[in-house]
Each structure stands twice: as structure tokens, then as C-alpha cells.
Interface confidence: medium
């Protein structure tokens, strides 16, 4: 793995994979099915999803001081979204198109999370809230919101890895 018991990931590898995730998240977003945005509502349905916030040490100073705080937060988010994309929200009906990038997105989330997981070290992962609805018309809404939230998450993660690759790589 890229973090063999140490505290520094393979920043360049992580940067490349996170950029790929950004592209996939944006390409997957319009393909979740037709949804009338008037139906969306103001309050965030996926308000339990992980967000990278100020206290998570993902700013340049925090990354220099101890990148593990930020990397753990990113790792938690990646696992969270990876589980969501593998759940019946995305695997259930209505079926995604055969060429949907969601499958690739799912695999890439897992790949990046494995790059960040130190060998023999297990970070706590966040519990997935009971978001799984039984009805397809509700799944469409959740897919839309999850992917929109994922876009924001991977955009921040990509910036973190870009900074790390530029300034923290050995």
C-alpha cells in the first residue's frame, strides 16, 4: 500500500486518482435518471454525509503539521460514499445504464481509500445513515443528492492531494 505504516501517502498517486474521481463524479451526475429539480426541496436530504470542514486539518498549515487528521477524514468520506454507491440506492431499480460511470466511480473510491489506509491500521469509518429507500422514485432523488454531495467532497480531496503532491512529496 502507499502508506506502509508511515504517515505520508503517495501524494502523486492520490492526486491522479482523485482527479479521476472528480471527472467520474461529474460524468455520473446527469446519468442518474430524469429528475424534476422542482421536486428537490430546500433541506439537504443527505445531511449526514461527511464534509471536510475547517477543523479537519486539510488546510495547507494543517497538512504540513500533521496530514493524518485530514487524510483520516478523507478516508472516512471515501469509505462512506463507496458503501453508498454499492448499496441498493444505486444497484436497485430503476437500473443504471450499462455504460454508467457509477461502477467505475465506485471502484475508484475503493482504490483511493486503499491508498490511504495504512497497513495494519484501521481508521474508524462513519456509519451510513439509513438512507436506503424501497421505492424507485425515491432512489432517483437520493442518487442525485448523493452524487452532488460526492462531487463537492472529491473536489476538496483533489485540492488536498494536489497541494500535497506539489509541496509535501518527498
Amino acid at each position: 500500500r502507499a502508506v506502509p505504516g508511515g504517515s505520508s501517502p503517495a501524494w502523486t498517486q492520490c492526486q491522479q486518482l482523485s482527479q479521476k474521481l472528480c471527472t467520474l463524479a461529474w460524468s455520473a451526475h446527469p446519468l442518474v435518471g430524469h429528475m424534476d429539480l422542482r421536486e428537490e426541496g430546500d433541506e439537504e436530504t443527505t445531511n449526514d454525509v461527511p464534509h471536510i470542514q475547517c477543523g479537519d486539518g486539510c488546510d495547507p498549515q494543517g497538512l504540513r503539521d500533521n496530514s493524518q487528521f485530514c487524510l483520516q477524514r478523507i478516508h472516512q468520506g471515501l469509505i462512506f460514499y463507496e458503501k453508498l454507491l454499492g448499496s441498493d440506492i444505486f444497484t436497485g431499480e430503476p437500473s443504471l445504464l450499462p455504460d454508467s460511470p457509477v461502477g467505475q466511480l465506485h471502484a475508484s473510491l475503493l482504490g483511493l481509500s486503499q491508498l490511504l489506509q495504512p497497513e495494519g491500521h484501521h481508521w474508524e469509518t462513519q456509519q451510513i445513515p439509513s438512507l436506503s429507500p424501497s421505492q424507485p422514485w425515491q432512489r432517483l432523488l437520493l442518487r442525485f443528492k448523493i452524487l452532488r454531495s460526492l462531487q463537492a467532497f472529491v473536489a476538496v480531496a483533489a485540492r488536498v492531494f494536489a497541494h500535497g503532491a506539489a509541496t509535501l512529496s518527498p
Epitope: 421536486e39 428537490e40 426541496g41 430546500d42 433541506e43 439537504e44 436530504t45 445531511n47 431499480e93 430503476p94 439509513s130 429507500p133 424501497s134 421505492q135 424507485p136 422514485w137 425515491q138 432517483l140 432523488l141
Partner: antibody
Framework: EVQLLESGGGLVQPGGSLRLSCAAS????????MGWVRQAPGKGLEWVSS????????WYADSVKGRFTISRDNSKNTLYLQMNSLRAEDTATYYC??????????WGQGTLVTVSS | DIQMTQSPSSLSASVGDRVTITCRAS??????LNWYQQKPGKAPKLLIY???SLQSGVPSRFSGSGSGTDFTLTISSLQPEDFATYYC?????????FGGGTKVEIK
């Protein structure tokens, strides 16, 4: 025991407004999608609107979109339907229903809304 | 919108008869089909959900089958309390839509 009790129906003139309420008990209200279904006298069932457990998403039938607003107060275990610009064709018994599994598993007794001049 | 077509719109039957009501969707809805019973002046009652699952407390003489576009509600031996109107409903996509109803009357 699950109970859904609608109120707020009555006679209203065309163009008028009414607010229906549905008081829920016997289950954890904030966990469930809730909805309204109506039935015009002597007619079949028509879905009107549904709302996500958190209130963060709503769905409407085209016939009421822009005129009706569904909302909920999870602290009060109450579902609402604000009906504006009422028309004669909105005359119906309005039922509150709880979604469970893939269906509307529990229904209230209904409240009659009559739109007439 | 998905249209739900029920047939027949009404039928006459006797106690003990086997009764079959059909419901057709205008497009595939997989197994997202529910059946309700309604008696005059009362709220609808869920009988069958997900095409074939019997709702808790509903007698086993009621059964549902079908997938895709064609569905059936069967009452194996009609009882006096079964005389009512039956509705199918799809929960595949919004707007959620109901069939026009089938009124089961005493012959």
C-alpha cells in the same frame, strides 16, 4: 397502534385556501415518507403529494403543483397540506397515508374538502 | 406518466367464488405494484404490496402475482366481507398512479 387523524377540511369558495393537518401516533413519525391521496365523490383514488422523512424533498401531482404545499413538523408528529387557489375539481376526501415497504400501508379516515360558491 | 388499467371495472360474484382482477401498467414497473381494498365511506386498506407480498393481518385467501406490466389479484374463496372496490397502484415512479378500481358486488 398506528393512527393518522386528518383535520381542516370544510367548505371553501373557488380561489380560496385551506390547510389540512394529519396528526400521527403509534410510530416514529420522523422515519417515514408521508403523503396525501384524494378521492373525489364517487371517483377513484388520486395521489396528491409526498414528503421525505426529513422534509427535505417533496413530490406533487401535476394537477396541484404550484397551488398545494406539503410540509411536516416532526417535533409535533404532524403532516400538513396547504391548499391555495382551490378549484371545484379539488373537491374530494383527502387522506393522509404513511409509506412503508413499497406501499401506502396506513391511512387516516379522511377529511372532506368541498370547493363551491 | 405510468397509466394503470384495471379490468373488469365491476363484477358480480357469489360467496365462495374465486375472483380474479387484473391490472396492466403502460410500461414496466417491475414488482412495484400494490393492491388496496376500499369499502364505502372508509379509507383504503393495503392488501398486497410489491406485487405478491401479503400485508400483515390480511387473510391468506388474497394473493397477488405478476411482474413487469401485467398483474393479478386473486381472492381464492370470496367472503361476505370481501364485497368492496379494489384498486391497484404503482410505486415505480412519480406521479404515483392508481387503477380505476374494480367493484366486486354480490350476485
Amino acid at each position: 397502534e398506528v393512527q393518522l387523524l386528518e383535520s381542516g377540511g370544510g367548505l371553501v369558495q373557488p380561489g380560496g385556501s385551506l390547510r389540512l393537518s394529519c396528526a400521527a401516533s403509534g410510530f416514529t413519525f420522523s422515519y417515514y415518507t408521508m403523503g396525501w391521496v384524494r378521492q373525489a365523490p364517487g371517483k377513484g383514488l388520486e395521489w396528491v403529494s409526498s414528503i421525505w422523512p426529513s422534509g427535505g424533498a417533496t413530490w406533487y401531482a401535476d394537477s396541484v403543483k404550484g397551488r398545494f404545499t406539503i410540509s411536516r413538523d416532526n417535533s409535533k408528529n404532524t403532516l400538513y397540506l396547504q391548499m391555495n387557489s382551490l378549484r371545484a375539481e379539488d373537491t374530494a376526501t383527502y387522506y393522509c397515508a404513511r409509506d412503508r415497504d413499497t406501499a401506502m400501508a396506513d391511512w387516516g379516515q379522511g377529511t372532506l374538502v368541498t370547493v363551491s360558491s | 406518466d405510468i397509466q394503470m388499467t384495471q379490468s373488469p371495472s365491476s363484477l358480480s360474484a357469489s360467496v365462495g367464488d374465486r375472483v380474479t382482477i387484473t391490472c396492466r401498467a403502460s410500461q414496466s414497473i417491475s414488482s412495484y405494484l400494490n393492491w388496496y381494498q376500499q369499502k364505502p365511506g372508509k379509507a383504503p386498506k393495503l392488501l398486497i404490496y410489491a406485487a405478491s407480498s401479503l400485508q400483515s393481518g390480511v387473510p391468506s385467501r388474497f394473493s397477488g402475482s405478476g411482474s413487469g406490466t401485467d398483474f393479478t389479484l386473486t381472492i381464492s374463496s370470496l367472503q361476505p366481507e370481501d364485497f368492496a372496490t379494489y384498486y391497484c397502484q404503482q410505486s415505480y415512479s412519480t406521479p404515483l398512479t392508481f387503477g380505476g378500481g374494480t367493484k366486486v358486488e354480490i350476485k
